[in-house]
């Protein structure tokens, strides 16, 4: 960093609250899509190019020209794996965080022409083609079709789908947001025969209603109506099923045949939680209970003589947690051999840290192939020789990311293949793999600007760099950027990380205002080596603000006993570590300790709120954004996972002391800003609200901003421009800022 | 490879009852449906019924009273049962693999004589 | 029953010439429609799935289009393996129903 006189010399621009809002320094990404183990797609100037790995050459898939007759605004397309067809997808319109409805056309690549006969219909809510060839399947008014060729009619596989009651092959609100983090419930067998689809259950889920305003026009606001269970509340039910693709007919209805869950999760509520196919005729399935410390695994083979699905009791597998939840947000998937019969899965061990455990599926122990004060975060890829992982073992950095490769006969040969390759400027990995592994992308994202490279797995040599941002590394040149620290404080002899985005030219000696950027939710993890180009930057850059994040007790990637510090607890220690770390950084010399304030967005809005209402005289303001307030308004799926029921037997106690309204009183020493989108299908508005009313009950004078219409992400381009700009005043202000 | 092989021909009695066989290679019973074709001397196809992958059965008016089309999953065979045989019941009579909705894989066929 | 109606029940041609065979049905049947070949010893492949689909393996030389009630089977540079009687098939609604057949003999 530069000395304070060089502060002055700087005769550099900024990073402005403009700049962030009309993102005018953009990072540039290279999105590939592999379409074979040496081929992959590349969007560049809209025409789409297909690449060659090894050699790096390139050739026109399909010129930008192509559909200039089409008539549509196309957003997205999807190229069959045989790469016969190409699926457009117009007239998006979104619905929650995953789903939206979408119109598709198919185009014919042999003939050069789309396909006008057996469309699929408008408002269709997910389309998907089989693993091999070019079947699809598709999700139209909750009932699943099939298409053996893009010119034949579909086949018909469901016929009970209602709307807000029955989705079969797509989820509902709770599995979409906290189950599957999709709106699809269909997984194609890898060749493609069989089709497995969940179908679920809303009858008795109770509805949240809220109004959307829509246009000045409207004389009476309509009424959503979602059903969504709220903690405690009546959960959807699941049932699955498989339908053998090759049997469809139109003169007959399809058999689905169900495969029913254990015994073990039919004695209570349960959720369908993973699907995996291993092999063309085995499939496994996850299952967890609604008290989620307790899952089971099944493997079902296919019987041909009789056309149905069994699930030996014998190769069932338990996973199950004392100490908290099973898996970070759920059970892990396992990842297969090629014969089926093994399989590769993250678990806690014994230590409570999430390692690598290698299964027979005969067999009920696992042995661990990985070990250490440090996670693996994800399988990345399985060959018959290798295991691809990502882990944040490097350097004992829990905020960063690697990629490694351990050797399936010999577990005690394990390669970093990221770790040196750029260790100043990439520490955060993320990868991307040639169908069969034979290549790979990877991409870092941080501390250094974005880097994209290729690399061969034969090797492991780096091919060719993808995208090295140059143009933005001269443009940021003339740009006065902050700096980030990543370092950790220790507190009850266990290390807790944090970071800070520190202005330019920042000097220790100096006092500068500090905002705590806040989530802390189960898993969460805040510090980390990416970089980014955010509101911190403005604030950093701009106004000398410091912006620092902190992973307290409840916090992921290092272990359950921090993890799991918080179970049944939420809104105690996760809480009392955020206020313990601002008090730590002011005693760090350069903090203005009269200028520290909290803001957090979701979770973090409810910890921002718990922490203005702690009445601990630290935080001179804070922002909630979007804030839980009271853990039995938010979803079932999610809030029971880490505070059990709401009811006297369980853990209704905690569930009344964590609430925000109950820290009223304390509102009268902070300055608070509370801000909500009125359509927010996540955290329903009705959450700031009952803040609202408590606040005014009790006499405190606050700030509040809602958004007409906006939901959990408040992403409209002119709502988005308005809270930054509307929180950013707020921030000066209170810091007495120009 | 797909294979339908018929079996069971022959001369059969006025009134009596017919039993043919179909045995099928390459392709499991319980995901194709196996239909039932026969061809009149000098005449055209006409189709009897089908026994789909899932056990269903649907048959043609023309012989429901008298057809009955069953399977043995384990020995990968299907057949075909005619009662109250008559003489315009003398056919070529073929099993025929049913793929969506086409006939993909037909048998050589068996003919059958109903003389007495 | 939907009925089936080939036409003509027999023709003659020389190698080499372009053949073309209808089919009508008594109702729409939209595209499910199917043709099949019948070798002079009894032996019966599929053609054509879906009024226009080419079965693989089936010689680029048959094509087949129509949908609703009318129908053709074009073979366009006839062939001496081509001797064979053709029927069409609607394959929308129980009982499936096929056409009389069309002969198709050499000149």
């Known amino acids: 960093n530069k000395g304070t006189d060089d502060a002055t010399a700087d005769s550099r621009k900024t990073y402005t609250l403009t700049d962030y809002l009309k993102n005018t320094y953009r990072l540039k990404l290279y999105s590939l899509r592999w379409i074979s183990d040496h081929e992959y797609l590349y969007k560049q100037e809209n025409n789409i190019l297909v690449f060659n790995a090894e050699y790096g050459n390139s050739s026109v898939f399909l010129e930008n020209s192509t559909f200039d007759e089409f008539g549509h605004s196309i957003n997205d397309y999807s190229i069959s794996p045989d790469g016969q067809f190409i699926l457009l997808e117009y007239n998006y319109v979104k619905q929650w965080r995953h789903s939206y409805t979408a119109s598709y056309d198919i185009y014919d690549l042999n003939k050069r022409q789309l396909i006008t006969e057996e469309r699929i219909p408008n408002n269709t809510q997910w389309v998907t083609w089989s693993p091999v060839g070019h079947k699809l399947a598709y999700v139209w008014n909750n009932d699943i079709y099939v298409k053996i060729e893009p010119n034949l009619p579909s086949y018909r596989i469901t016929w009970t789908g209602k709307e807000d009651i029955i989705y079969n092959g797509i989820t509902d609100w709770v599995y979409e947001e906290e189950v599957f983090s999709a709106y699809s419930a269909l997984w194609w067998s890898p060749n493609g025969t069989f089709l497995a689809y969940a179908q679920f259950n809303d009858t008795e889920v109770p509805l949240i209603e809220y109004s959307f305003y829509s246009d000045e026009s409207l004389q009476y606001p309509k009424t959503v109506r979602v059903p969504y269970p709220k903690a405690g509340a009546v959960n959807p039910t699941v049932k699955f099923f498989v339908v053998n693709t090759d049997s469809l007919s139109s003169v007959t209805n399809a058999t689905s045949i169900q495969i029913t869950a254990p015994a073990s999760m039919l004695i209570g509520d349960h959720y369908l939680c993973d699907v995996t196919w291993a092999t063309q005729e085995r499939i496994s399935l996850q299952w967890l209970r609604r008290i989620q410390n307790y899952s089971v695994m099944d493997i079902c083979d296919y019987d041909e003589s009789s056309g149905r699905w069994n699930c030996l009791v014998a190769r069932q597998h338990i996973e199950m947690s004392t100490t908290g939840w099973v898996g970070r947000f759920r059970p892990s998937e396992p990842h297969f051999t090629l014969d089926g019969n093994s399989f590769y899965k993250i678990i806690s061990n014994e230590e409570g840290y999430r390692h690598i455990c290698y299964f027979q599926i005969d067999k009920k122990d696992c042995t661990f192939i990985t070990k250490g004060t440090w996670e693996v975060i994800g399988i990345e890829a399985l060959t018959s020789d290798y295991l691809y992982y990502i882990s944040n073992e490097y350097k004992g950095m829990p905020g960063g990311r690697n990629l490694y490769k351990i050797q399936l006969s010999d577990y005690t040969k394990v390669t970093c293949l990221s770790c040196e390759l750029n260790p100043e400027r990439c520490q955060y990995y993320s990868v991307s793999f040639s169908k069969e592994a034979k290549y790979y992308q990877l991409r870092c994202s941080g501390p250094g600007l974005p880097l994209y490279t290729l690399h061969s797995s034969v090797n492991d040599k780096g091919l060719r760099v993808l995208e090295d941002n140059s143009a933005l590394d001269k443009m940021l040149q003339n740009v006065q950027m902050p700096s980030k620290k990543l370092d950790f404080i220790i507190l009850n002899e266990t290390k807790f990380w944090y970071q800070m985005i520190l202005p330019p030219h920042f000097d220790k000696s100096k006092k500068y205002p500090l905002l705590l950027d806040v989530y802390a939710g189960p898993c969460s993890q805040k510090a980390d080596t990416v970089f980014r180009l955010n509101w911190a930057t403005y604030l950093a850059s701009t106004e000398n603000i410091i912006v620092a994040s902190f992973d307290g007790r409840g916090s992921g990637y290092q272990g359950d006993k921090i993890m799991h510090a918080i179970n049944r607890r939420l809104g105690t220690f996760e809480v009392e570590d955020q206020i313990e770390a601002a008090r730590q950084f002011s005693k760090m010399g350069f903090v203005d300790n009269k200028r520290i304030a909290i803001w957090g967005w979701s979770y973090g809005g409810y910890v921002t709120s718990m922490v203005l209402g702690s009445g601990s005289g630290v935080f001179k303001c804070g922002i909630a954004v979007a804030p839980v307030s009271r853990w039995e308004y938010y979803d079932s799926v999610y809030t029971e996972r880490y505070m059990g029921l709401p009811t006297p037997e369980d853990n209704l106690d905690h569930y009344r002391n964590s609430t925000v309204m109950s820290r009223a009183e304390n509102f009268k020493q902070v300055e608070y800003l509370l801000i909500h989108g009125t359509a927010d299908d996540n955290v329903h508005f009705q959450q700031s609200a009952q803040i609202s009313k408590a606040l005014v009950d009790v006499g405190v004078d606050f700030q509040a901003m809602w958004y007409t219409d906006e939901d959990h992400g408040i992403a409209s381009s002119t709502a988005h421009q308005h809270i930054y700009t509307h929180m950013s005043h707020f921030i000066k202000q209170c810091f007495s800022l120009p | 490879e797909v294979q339908l092989v018929e079996s069971g021909a022959g001369v059969e009695q006025p009134g009596g009852t017919l039993r043919l066989t179909c045995t099928a290679s390459?392709?499991?019973?319980?995901?194709?449906?196996v239909h039932w074709v026969r061809q009149a001397p000098g005449k055209g196809l006409e189709w009897m019924g089908v026994?789909?992958?899932?056990?269903?059965?649907d048959y043609d008016a023309a012989f429901m009273s008298r057809v009955t089309i069953s399977r043995d999953t384990s020995k990968s065979t299907a057949y075909l049962q005619l009662n109250s045989l008559r003489a315009e019941d003398t056919a070529v009579y073929y099993c025929v693999r049913n793929r969506h909705d086409w006939f993909d894989y037909w048998g050589q066929g068996t003919t059958v004589t109903v003389s007495s | 029953d939907i009925q089936m109606t080939q036409s003509p029940s027999s023709l003659s041609a020389s190698l080499g010439d372009r053949v073309t065979i209808t089919c009508s049905a008594s109702?729409?049947?939209?595209?499910?429609l199917n043709w099949y070949q019948q070798k002079p010893d009894g032996a019966v492949k599929l053609l054509i799935y879906y009024s226009s689909n080419l079965h693989s393996g089936v010689p680029s030389r048959f094509s087949g289009s129509g949908s609703g009630t009318d129908f053709s089977l074009t073979i366009s540079n006839l062939e001496p393996e081509d001797i064979a009687t053709y029927y069409c098939q609607q394959s929308i609604k129980l009982p499936f129903t096929f056409g009389s057949g069309t002969k198709l003999e050499i000149k």
């Open positions: 109702q729409g049947i939209r595209n499910s």
């Open positions: 026994i789909w992958g899932d056990g269903r059965t």
């Open positions: 390459g392709f499991s019973l319980t995901t194709y449906g």
